[in-house]
Amino acid sequence: ESALITQQDLAPQQRAAPQQKRSSPSEGLCPPGHHISEDGRDCISCKYGQDYSTHWNDLLFCLRCTRCDSGEVELSPCTTTRNTVCQCEEGTFREEDSPEMCRKCRTGCPRGMVKVGDCTPWSDIECVHKESGTKHSGEVPAVEETVTSSPGTPASPCSLSG
């Protein structure tokens, strides 16, 4: 389980830094792209490419920009109002249940099944039974049952749903 964000995980602001613009809080909050000063009197801008805030806030620190992992490509860079957007490289995908890593897509479907959905950065290939059209969510079957397979492809559970 992940630990909560601590102040070490956030990018502290050098309050005297001349490049950081200041403005006054509105109703005790600072706008996207800013955080509030410790005395609550100023809104201090986040540093482009280093940290960000996406909504009105009373944060003492902007949030540190995400760095894309190896195996990911950067779709859009971090700005003061939006975190970096990372996406799995071609041929890999990220499941919602295990968002911490990109996994290799299978290269083919089990025998008796046909591919109806391609590998995307968000999902493995989708296979259905030829006859029934029942979905198969990604079990890698025994080697002799595999139409095409790639070594090192991690197994994931199979759930047949009507």
Epitope: A3, I5, H35, N57, D58, L59, L60, L63, P99
Partner: nanobody, 125 residues
Amino acid sequence: EVQLLESGGGEVQPGGSLRLSCAASGRSISNYAMGWFRQAPGKEREFVSASVWNQGGNYYAESVKGRFTISRDDAKSTLYLQMSSLRAEDTAVYYCVVARTPETPITSARGANYWGQGTLVTVKP
């Protein structure tokens, strides 16, 4: 598994106040990101507010800025939303949300792993 139970909704006049509570059970929420979304009749769910990190600050949608205040009591596994200066456009079902990964606040519905059943807030004269 985390179960969420919201309470505190009801009918209130414009300008009135309500305090919503969200009690979490199943496990401690101290290591979880939490927040509130709402869904007005015929509209999509929208972000309201999020607790960004423990003992830290919070995020608010522009539409509720200065009127709503989010807070949490990890010892009681409870999230709160104090709503004041309520308007007719605040009428909605309010949902408490929790995410297993707290590195970033929950500002989109996709980031939430668990949802409460919702509590209805109606603002009318």
